[in-house]
């Protein structure tokens, strides 16, 4: 674990003046209500910040924002309400900032009663200048931009029309009436359910699936029956009233809705409810809901087809009243995965997968920490580390996890060490490995975050009392330091970096309380100095991912290749920098069976790795069919793991079986596949906000 | 100081069997990798087996693979190669190396440490 | 097909030259790769692992470069104990362990 404060540390030299030169405050004259704050842009240092008061009175809200923006990455900010004509920005849509470098920003307005339409006022040139556009609609959602267009926008009315711009929100068009849902897919494509009925709430199930190519021009029902729909990496999903009108099953289409299978998953009726944990362009995350109230279900991961599903994790803790899930993607090492599960005894226990779920493992805990009260037997218990399930619970957790693509291997979290997760005071643990193994690196709760790649963490405790002291530690939170960036103690609310990872500042935000009023500020700390000089090629060393015995030849191998990566050396202060690249290098391995999945038709008894054929498909558990092309219906019984590498080695050929006379379905006939079908879930922008944090990728 | 001492070479018809043995001293044995290297008269190196520590990983190459077996007793400090089925192209000295390896993840290690040799030939 | 193979297969120096030999495999190894010098009758002697890393107790006038495919050993003065013959072995590629055939360094 990491050493304390009085061990011997690589101590950054007089650190306390070189933070007091870049320490830059700043007092927001307004009274306290809500502040959000957005980032223009990557790498240009614009943020622009909007704070709202508000009252609520019996008829409507009356309400103050102010705007404002900085150009510095936060250390200096410039009141713009006047650009915005001193109108209250509505809150619940945020500011809407365009994807990319676009410079783009739509700010929605509050509007009265009584108006034909919405207000906003829109920005192509980084918050520098805003143009006020009046709508021909109220808005229900916030504006979408088009991922490959940021001049294409799409919004729903609150009378559940569908709106397009082409001009980044000038002119709009009503596309469509009484839409649902609607999302961006691939290639400018608009995908949206509608029911012709006219009710979004009342006969979910009944919907259809359109989709445009032409911004509205025309259009194509693509699936009948739906429940709902998502998109995730390449895959388009829907989940549809199977012919019994009780049941839901999903289905999956990887040509934008032109041709539809149905996916290899236990149907559910209508008080469970399937999840897209996970997706990208090569599998898929499924969660699917056990029958009743239980709080959990059963994780599957796809084939490349979207299609075939392995049963990858029981007892999967997911809430059916408040929709929690401790899932979670760590982006700093590929393959890795952790969630929570609910024992048989109703504890929650975290595990962790390292090869993209195919199996799940507890987390070890430190070499030197003691099992807590948790724990049957005090020497032998593992990390639990908490996410959502925690917070929504109420417990003293003030972040999610955090990993990061550019910072290799680095996971922070909080957790208890013991047999199940404990509602006692949580601890912060570092991870350097990817999630293998784990110190703690700070006692009691706080909020963190990644700065330079790794090349800094930044922490503050979390106290109900007001605070001045940040912590931060440049060997990935084995030692760290403390600065007192502010003689008089703030109320925190909250620590903000540029997103990414890649910034050298951070800003602290909170509230002074006086007698009379109270005031929001901001201290911004860069920590450039710190990190005096570039990264040179002798501050990096090699590190193989995944490697857990040296020994072994195919250490180090997951999905069929090892990567090895130029990591920071801890004792190495030094800037990584803005422009800062993950150098790796893969090395592919020799094939086994456990590169391969089962492919329909077959399953891996237990304790085998040989894919073996169900002797009986009909009315088998996980019915499945493949319509169409002839290929389709042919397999050997394996199927490469979607994303594996592997070459050589074992080639798990069979002969090749023709499955069309064993492959039945109640589901959907043949001779309706290609015109109308049904799919299931998916894709970025999930149906309920409460997922946005952990990017949970589609709920029903 | 460290040392790796091979012996049982020798000559042998083909088809025959022999048995070679490698004594290590100056280090602990039971915590490294050990392999068993060739040289052709006149030729360059060839690798031909390896086993880790605890005898949990055991490689060959394909070249051997069915005719030889590595082993080691770690109580004795010492390193094996059973060679039955022996061929002409088998003639060659047999080295044994130690693989020192680095922490998980930090390096890939080399063969570090290497006997003197022992002479097998294969004649009728 | 051979794993690695060096060049050149033999290469005539004097003392005091900068000498440069490659290594070429033909899969990505990243950095698992070791040189080692042999004399005539005498065992190979360990140079550089892990691509790059001097051995400790060799000369710093070896030193090596490259991961991924492509790798060298340079020794940047010759001096008359250098001559000898060269080998590169992987770590992470197939077959295991493989040598490359080797780099005769001779005396003009």
């Known amino acids: 674990s990491a050493p304390g404060e009085d061990e011997e540390c690589g101590r950054v030299r007089d650190f306390v003046a070189k933070l007091a030169n870049n320490t830059h405050q700043h007092v927001f004259d307004d009274l306290r209500g809500s502040v959000s704050l957005s980032w223009v842009g990557d790498s240009t240092g614009v943020i622009l910040v909007l704070t709202t008061f508000h009252v609520p009175l019996v008829i409507m809200t009356f309400g103050q924002s102010k705007l404002y923006r900085s150009e510095d990455y936060g250390k200096n900010f410039k009141d713009i309400t006047d650009l915005i004509n001193n109108t209250f920005i509505r809150t619940e849509f945020g500011m809407a900032i365009g994807p990319e470098n676009s410079g783009k920003v739509v700010l929605t307005a509050e509007v009265s009663g009584g108006s034909r339409g919405g207000r906003i006022f829109r920005s192509s040139d980084f918050a520098k200048n805003f143009v006020q556009t009046d709508l021909p609609f109220h808005p229900l959602t916030q504006m979408m931009y088009s991922p490959q267009n940021s001049d294409y926008l799409l919004a729903l009315s609150t009378e559940n029309g569908l709106w397009v711009s082409k001009n980044f929100g000038g002119k709009w068009e009503e596309i469509h009436k009484t839409v649902c849902l609607a999302k961006w897919g691939r290639k400018g494509t608009i995908f949206f359910t509608a029911n012709h009925n006219g009710s979004c709430s009342n006969d979910r199930g009944m919907l259809e699936l359109e989709r445009t190519t032409d911004y509205g021009k025309s259009f194509k029902t693509v699936a009948s029956k739906i429940y709902s729909f998502g998109l995730g990496g390449k895959f388009l999903f829907a989940s549809v009233m199977t012919g019994k009108g009780t049941l839901r099953a999903i289905h999956v289409s990887v040509d934008d809705g032109d041709t539809w299978n149905m996916a290899q998953l236990p149907p559910v009726g209508h008080e469970q409810f399937y999840s897209i944990l996970a997706a990208n362009d090569e599998m898929v995350f499924m969660h699917v809901d056990e029958p009743g109230d239980s709080g959990f279900g059963t994780i599957y991961v796809s084939d490349d087809r979207g299609t075939v599903y392995s049963k990858s994790l029981e007892r999967h803790l997911y809430t059916t009243t408040g929709g929690e899930t401790d899932f979670i993607n760590v982006t700093s090492l590929r393959g890795v995965f952790t969630t929570s599960i609910l024992a048989e005894d109703k504890s929650v226990q975290s595990v962790i997968s390292f090869d993209q779920g195919g199996e799940w493992v507890p987390l070890r805990k430190p070499a030197d920490s003691k099992c807590d009260a948790t724990a049957r037997d005090p020497e032998k218990c593992s990390l639990h580390i908490h996410a959502a399930y925690s917070i929504a619970t109420g417990l003293n957790v003030p972040m999610l996890p955090l990993s990061e693509p550019n910072a290799v291997g680095l996971v922070l979290a909080h957790g208890s060490v013991g047999d199940a997760i404990s509602v006692m005071r949580p601890d912060v643990y570092v991870s350097d490995d990817g999630g293998y193994t784990w110190i703690k690196a700070l006692e009691g709760p706080h909020y963190y975050t990644i700065l330079d790649s790794g090349g800094i963490i930044v922490a503050i405790e979390h106290s109900s009392r007001p605070i001045n002291v940040i912590k931060f530690s440049t060997d990935e939170g084995q030692c760290w330091q403390t600065y007192t960036f502010t003689r008089d103690p703030i109320y925190f609310t909250g620590l903000a970096s540029e997103p990414g990872a890649r910034s050298m500042n951070i800003s602290i935000w909170g509230f002074t309380e006086s007698f009379l009023t109270s005031q929001w500020v901001s201290y911004t700390i860069d920590f450039k100095d710190i990190l005096e000089r570039n990264c040179e090629e002798k501050d990096y060393t090699i590190w193989l991912a995944h490697s857990t015995d040296p020994e072994d030849y195919e250490d180090g191998c997951i999905l069929g290749y090892k990567e090895q990566f130029l990591r920071l050396r801890k004792s190495s202060v030094c800037q990584n920098g803005r422009d800062y690249v993950v150098t790796k290098q893969p090395s592919i391995c020799l094939c086994s069976l456990e590169d391969f999945l089962c492919d329909f038709g077959y399953y891996r008894p237990e304790n085998d790795s040989k894919c073996v054929e169900q002797p009986e498909l009909k009315g088998h558990d996980l019915e499945f069919c493949l319509y169409g092309r002839e290929e389709h219906l042919t397999t050997n019984g394996y199927r490469k793991i979607p994303g594996d590498k592997c070459q050589g080695g074992v080639n798990p050929v069979r002969e090749v079986k023709d499955l069309k006379k064993k492959c039945t379905s109640n589901f959907l006939s043949p001779e309706k596949q290609n015109s109308k079908s049904n799919g299931s879930a998916g894709g970025s922008g999930g149906l309920n906000d409460i997922f946005e944090a952990q990017k949970i990728e589609w709920h029903e | 100081e460290v040392q790796l001492v091979e012996s049982g070479g020798g000559l042998v018809k083909p088809g025959g069997s022999l048995r070679l043995s490698c004594a290590a001293s100056?280090?602990?044995?039971?915590?490294?990798?050990m392999n068993w290297v060739r040289q052709a008269p006149g030729k360059g190196l060839e690798w031909v087996s390896s086993?880790?520590?605890?005898?949990?990983?055991?490689y060959y190459a394909d070249s051997v693979k069915g005719r030889f077996t590595i082993s080691r007793d770690n109580a004795k400090n010492s390193l094996y190669l059973q060679m039955n089925s022996l061929r002409a192209e088998d003639t060659a000295v047999y080295y044994c190396?130690?693989?020192?390896?680095?922490?998980?993840?930090?390096?890939?290690?080399?063969?570090?440490?290497w006997g003197q040799g022992t002479m097998v030939t294969v004649s009728s | 097909a051979r794993q690695l193979t060096q060049s050149p297969s033999s290469l005539s120096a004097s003392v005091g030259d900068r000498v440069t030999i490659t290594c070429r495999a033909s899969?990505?190894?990243?950095?698992?790769l070791a040189w080692y010098q042999q004399k005539p009758g005498k065992v190979p002697k360990l140079l550089i692992y892990d691509a790059s890393s001097l051995e400790s107790g060799v000369p710093s006038r070896f030193s090596g470069s490259g991961s991924g495919t492509d790798f060298t050993l340079t020794i940047s003065s010759l001096q008359p104990e250098d001559f000898a013959t060269y080998y590169c072995?992987?770590?992470?590629?197939?077959?295991?362990?493989?040598f490359g055939q080797g780099t005769k360094l001779e005396i003009i």
């Open positions: 072995q992987q770590f992470n590629g197939y077959p295991m362990f493989s």
């Open positions: 899969q990505g190894i990243t950095s698992a």
């Open positions: 190396a130690r693989r020192r390896i680095a922490a998980a993840g930090t390096g890939y290690g080399a063969f570090d440490i």
């Open positions: 086993i880790s520590s605890s005898s949990s990983y055991i």
């Open positions: 100056g280090f602990t044995f039971s915590s490294y990798s």
